[in-house]
C-alpha cells in the first residue's frame, strides 16, 4: 500500500551500462529488471540518481569487476559512492577495495556499498571506479539503487 | 510502531541450512536469530520467500563460500538472487562472482548481495550458487532476507 | 516527511574511528557524513548503537581491511555484527570471512554485512573483527549503521 | 555467434532411454531459459519441455509429463534431457532452443535453434 500522497514510496534500482567513455563514472540504465519508483527520483544522463525530496534514504551500490594483479596497476579496484549537492562539491560517501586477483586472464570480483544518508533536494548520488574497463555488465553483475526511508 | 492493520510491516531474514540435495538453488531455516514478521511472508520449501502482498521491497542475501583454485572449476564462485513470480521462468535479480582462493585447504570469502525490487503477489525469490557444497553454515555467514517499504 | 511524533524516523550511520585499544570491538564516531536522528538511537562508548525502541531494523556493516596472508595467522580476516541485549550475553548476528591476500605489503579486501532484525529497548548493536589493526580507516572505508523499519 | 550442438540421439528400443545434449556457446547461457523441440517424420514442430536460466522453473509437454526431465549444468554451458520410457510416437529428430529473452512465459518465442538430433524409437 503507498504511503498516500503526501508521502510516497521512493526508490531506484538501475542497471549497468557499458560505456565508450573513458570516465571512471559508471553509467547505469532503466532496463531489465529496474525500478523508478515516481518521478520523485530520476536517472539523469546515466549516471547520477537524482532526488526531488529532502530526507533520509539508504543508497546502494554492487559492482563486480575482472581484473588481474599483472595486467593492472599495483593500486586496488576501488568503488566510490559519491555525493554532490547543488552548489558544492562532490563528496565521497563510501569506499570499498579489492587487490587485483592473480587468476588469468582475469579474476572475477563483486563489491557492496551501502548506508544510510540526509539527502537534500536536488542532491544526486553516483557511483566511480577506478577502472570502469573492468567492471562486469553481465546480467545483474553491477547495479545501484536507493530508497527513502 | 506497527503501520496498523492496513499496511503492516512485511520482514523475513532467515539462516542458512546445510543439505544434501544436489540442488544448487541454497537452503533456509527459521532458526537461530531469525525474522518472519507474519504471514505476508513465508518461507517455502526451505529454499524460497514468497510474498503475498504487492509493492516494493529491499531484497539481500549474504553468503559465505570456502574454496581453492585447484580443486574448483576454471569458473568463479557465482550466487544469484533470482525471482520465480507465477506462471513464468525464474529471473536473475542480483549476481555476484568471487574467483576462487589459492589458500589450502580452501579460502573462505563473502559475497554481499541486495536490491530494490516489485514484487507480485505469490511471487518468490531464491539463491542459486554455482557450488552448495562450498558454502558455509556457521553461525551469521550465510544468511537470506527481505523488507517491504 | 518525518512519519509523525508518533513513529519518527530513526537511523544512524557512523564512521570508523582508529584505536590504541587492543579491543578487537571497531570504534566509531559522529564524523564526516554520519547520520544520527534523534535520540532514540545512540552512538555509545564510540563502540555501539544503542536504540530505545522495540521493533524490526535493518543493521549493517562495511569494513575494509588490508593484509597479508605470510604476516597474518593462518585464519582468515572475520568480521562480525553482535547484539547484546540488556542481561544477557552478546550473540552474532551476522559475519563475513575473506582470507587474507598474497599481495605485499598487504592487499584491501571490503566485507559488507546487512540484515533484518529485532531489537529490543535498550538493545546494542556493535561490529568485532579478527585484527582491527588491519582495518582501513580512509574516508568511506569502514561504516556502521541501521535504520527502523 | 550464438552455437547449439546437440548429441546423444540414436537407436533405441520401446521402454528405453536416451539423454541428449546441448552444449551452448556464444552467449552468456546462464541467463537464458532454454528448451527442447521436435519433428517427427511428416510432422510439424511440437514443444517438448523448457527450463528457466537456473533450473527452478521446468515446464514439459503433456505427452512426455513423467518420462523425460529436462536440466543443465551452468559451469558446463551444456542443456540435457533424460528421455525414459521412450516410445515409438517419440521417433523424432530434437533440437536444442534458446529463448530470445531472459525471463518470461514458457510458450514465448526462441531465438536461436541447433541442428537436431536423431532419437529412432524402433523394436
Known amino acids: 500500500m503507498q504511503k498516500g500522497d503526501q508521502n510516497p514510496q521512493i526508490a531506484a534500482h538501475v542497471i549497468s551500462e557499458a560505456s565508450s567513455k573513458t570516465t571512471s563514472v559508471l553509467q547505469w540504465a532503466e532496463k531489465g529488471y529496474y525500478t523508478m519508483s515516481n518521478n520523485l527520483v530520476t536517472l539523469e544522463n546515466g549516471k547520477q540518481l537524482t532526488v526531488k525530496r529532502q530526507g533520509l534514504y539508504y543508497i546502494y551500490a554492487q559492482v563486480t569487476f575482472c581484473s588481474n594483479r599483472e595486467a593492472s596497476s599495483q593500486a586496488p579496484f576501488i568503488a566510490s559512492l559519491c555525493l554532490k549537492s547543488p552548489g558544492r562539491f562532490e563528496r565521497i560517501l563510501l569506499r570499498a577495495a579489492n587487490t587485483h586477483s592473480s587468476a588469468k586472464p582475469c579474476g572475477q570480483q563483486s563489491i557492496h556499498l551501502g548506508g544510510v544518508f540526509e539527502l537534500q533536494p536536488g542532491a544526486s548520488v553516483f557511483v566511480n571506479v577506478t577502472d570502469p574497463s573492468q567492471v562486469s555488465h553481465g546480467t545483474g553483475f553491477t547495479s545501484f539503487g536507493l530508497l527513502k526511508l | 510502531m506497527q503501520k496498523g492493520d492496513q499496511n503492516p510491516q512485511i520482514a523475513a531474514h532467515v539462516i542458512s541450512e546445510a543439505s544434501s540435495k544436489t540442488t544448487s538453488v541454497l537452503q533456509w531455516a527459521e532458526k537461530g536469530y531469525y525474522t518472519m514478521s507474519n504471514n505476508l511472508v513465508t518461507l517455502e520449501n526451505g529454499k524460497q520467500l514468497t510474498v503475498k502482498r504487492q509493492g516494493l521491497y529491499y531484497i539481500y542475501a549474504q553468503v559465505t563460500f570456502c574454496s581453492n583454485r585447484e580443486a574448483s572449476s576454471q569458473a568463479p564462485f557465482i550466487a544469484s538472487l533470482c525471482l520465480k513470480s507465477p506462471g513464468r521462468f525464474e529471473r536473475i535479480l542480483l549476481r555476484a562472482a568471487n574467483t576462487h582462493s589459492s589458500a589450502k585447504p580452501c579460502g573462505q570469502q563473502s559475497i554481499h548481495l541486495g536490491g530494490v525490487f516489485e514484487l507480485q503477489p505469490g511471487a518468490s525469490v531464491f539463491v542459486n550458487v554455482t557450488d552448495p557444497s562450498q558454502v558455509s553454515h556457521g553461525t551469521g555467514f550465510t544468511s537470506f532476507g527481505l523488507l517491504k517499504l | 516527511m518525518q512519519k509523525g511524533d508518533q513513529n519518527p524516523q530513526i537511523a544512524a550511520h557512523v564512521i570508523s574511528e582508529a584505536s590504541s585499544k587492543t579491543t578487537s570491538v571497531l570504534q566509531w564516531a559522529e564524523k564526516g557524513y554520519y547520520t544520527m536522528s534523534n535520540n532514540l538511537v545512540t552512538l555509545e562508548n564510540g563502540k555501539q548503537l544503542t536504540v530505545k525502541r522495540q521493533g524490526l531494523y535493518y543493521i549493517y556493516a562495511q569494513v575494509t581491511f588490508c593484509s597479508n596472508r605470510e604476516a597474518s595467522s593462518q585464519a582468515p580476516f572475520i568480521a562480525s555484527l553482535c547484539l547484546k541485549s540488556p542481561g544477557r550475553f552478546e550473540r552474532i548476528l551476522l559475519r563475513a570471512a575473506n582470507t587474507h591476500s598474497s599481495a605485499k605489503p598487504c592487499g584491501q579486501q571490503s566485507i559488507h554485512l546487512g540484515g533484518v532484525f529485532e531489537l529490543q529497548p535498550g538493545a546494542s548493536v556493535f561490529v568485532n573483527v579478527t585484527d582491527p589493526s588491519q582495518v582501513s580507516h580512509g574516508t568511506g572505508f569502514t561504516s556502521f549503521g541501521l535504520l527502523k523499519l | 555467434e550464438v552455437q547449439l550442438l546437440e548429441s546423444g540421439g540414436g537407436l533405441v528400443q520401446p521402454g528405453g532411454s536416451l539423454r541428449l545434449s546441448c552444449a551452448a556457446s556464444?552467449?552468456?547461457?546462464?541467463?537464458?531459459?532454454m528448451g527442447w523441440v521436435r519433428q517427427a517424420p511428416g510432422k510439424g514442430l511440437e514443444w517438448v519441455s523448457s527450463?528457466?536460466?537456473?533450473?527452478?522453473?521446468?515446464y514439459y509437454a503433456d505427452s512426455v509429463k513423467g518420462r523425460f526431465t529436462i536440466s543443465r549444468d551452468n559451469s558446463k554451458n551444456t542443456l540435457y534431457l533424460q528421455m525414459n520410457s521412450l516410445r515409438a510416437e517419440d521417433t523424432a529428430v530434437y533440437y536444442c532452443?534458446?529463448?530470445?529473452?531472459?525471463?518470461?512465459?514458457?510458450?514465448?518465442?526462441?531465438?536461436?535453434w541447433g541442428q537436431g538430433t536423431l532419437v529412432t524409437v524402433s523394436s
Open positions: 556464444g552467449f552468456t547461457f546462464m541467463d537464458y531459459p
Open positions: 532452443a534458446k529463448y530470445g529473452g531472459t525471463s518470461g512465459r514458457h510458450n514465448t518465442k526462441f531465438d536461436y
Open positions: 527450463i528457466g536460466p537456473v533450473g527452478m522453473s521446468t
